[in-house]
């Protein structure tokens, strides 16, 4: 009976999410393997988040709007482990917008989700950021490593979206 009601609840939650995400990929987790954590297909998952790499070349603002329409934001990177996971799926000759910008050009960087910008947990390439006119951040591969660079916000780039996992 308990399992039956849990299944019914799960199905109604799935139907609710299906309006927004035609297909979800779910895995069982939790100490009793009773919880399902899901990401929209074909998003990838890491810890408590889902990631989507957009190969459409768009400005930073349009990229953020595009993520927003999918219930996500441009990616906020909180740890080196998270960055290492993300970069496994990136192409080394491409650049991807992050959810990090400095709209006034005062070098006051801010994350799209209002996570405090912590200078100690940043992965700028050597010498970056280097221009007050370059107010948006990308991740790219340079000098044999992945790192961040400030670029013009209006220049079209690929992008990475991030959203919280869906728990059902």
């Amino acid at each position: 009976n308990f399992m039956y009601s849990k299944t019914v609840k799960r199905l109604s939650k799935l139907q609710e999410y299906q309006q927004y995400y035609p297909s979800l990929t779910c895995v069982m987790e939790g100490k009793d393997m009773e919880d399902w954590s899901c990401c929209p297909t074909p998003w990838t998952s890491f810890q408590s988040s889902c990631y989507f790499i957009s190969t459409v070349m768009q400005s930073w603002t349009k990229s953020q709007n595009n993520c927003s329409v999918m219930g996500a934001d441009l990616v906020v990177i909180n740890t080196k482990e998270e960055q290492d996971f993300i970069t496994q799926n990136l192409k080394i000759n491409s650049a991807y917008f992050l959810g990090l910008s400095d709209p006034k050009g005062w070098r006051h960087w801010q994350w799209v989700d209002q996570t405090p910008y912590n200078k100690n947990v940043t992965f700028w390439h050597s010498g970056e950021p280097n221009s007050p006119d370059e107010r948006c951040a990308i991740i790219n591969f340079r000098s044999e490593e992945w790192g961040w660079n400030d670029v013009h916000c209006h220049v079209p780039q690929k992008s990475i979206c991030k959203m919280k996992k869906i728990y059902i």
Epitope: S59, P103, S131, D133, R135, V151, H154, P156
Partner: antibody
């Protein structure tokens, strides 16, 4: 006082080349992105190319891509536009304009007086 | 590319009256309260001159008779009251994404 002075325009045959120059004064040239904008006779404004302050980024519309090259010499406070394989539709007044960044975009806050390019056989 | 459509293409206004020019973008040029639409004035034989930046900010030295408003896809330049030396072409321009694009222009004539 900010000044932008274009030169190098003239009459050229289709398929020919021209190099436009823009001499900048009255501001720290190396700190600003710069653009070329053109205006065909009796027509509106059309952006032609952009170069970032540090020379790291150049951008062109499809109409001139592969034929025009924008460059700058910050030591000489000068902006250039090398125009090759010119066509009749490139006939226009070419303006050099300074970009001023605002939030996620920019606008053109100073313009030169323009130099006229005529492509005709 | 973002297409900007200006209307009307031309208008004749008497001195002391109000002139209103609109610019419609093919997609939004606003983001979180910032509107990346700008307005220029161009008199015959002269280069364009910046009037308004970011939809509503008056450029230094431009008379307060000029004002701008709008957000998203719809923007307006207003001249009130119009003076004789306002006869010119007026252009809108967006910069939210490359390539930067201009409207087709509006010719303002003084009656």
């Amino acid at each position: 006082e900010v000044q932008l002075v274009e030169s190098g325009g003239g009459l050229v045959k289709p398929g020919g080349s021209l190099r436009l120059s823009c001499a900048a004064s009255g501001f720290t040239f190396s700190s600003y992105g710069m653009s070329w904008v053109r205006q065909a006779p009796g027509k509106g404004l059309e952006w032609v190319s952009t170069i970032s302050s540090g020379d790291s980024y150049t951008y062109y519309p499809d109409s001139v891509k592969g034929r025009f090259t924008i460059s700058r010499d910050n030591a000489k406070n000068s902006l250039y536009l090398q125009m090759n394989s010119l066509r009749a539709e490139d006939t226009a007044v070419y303006y050099c304009a300074r970009q001023l960044y605002y939030s996620y975009g920019y606008y053109f806050d100073y313009w030169g007086q323009g130099t006229t390019v005529t492509v005709s056989s | 590319d973002i297409v900007l459509t200006q209307s009307p293409a031309s208008l004749a206004v008497s001195p002391g009256q109000r002139a209103t020019i609109t610019c419609r973008a093919s997609e939004s040029v606003s983001f979180h309260g910032t509107h990346l639409m700008h307005w220029y004035q161009q008199k015959p034989g002269q280069p364009p001159k910046l009037l308004i930046y970011a939809a509503s900010n008056l450029e230094s030295g431009v008379p307060a008779r000029f004002s701008g408003s709008g957000s998203g896809t719809d923007f307006t330049l207003t001249i009130n009251p119009v003076e004789a030396n306002d006869a010119a072409n007026y252009y809108c321009q967006q910069s939210i994404e490359d390539p930067p694009t201009f409207g087709g222009g509006t010719k303002v004539e003084i009656k």
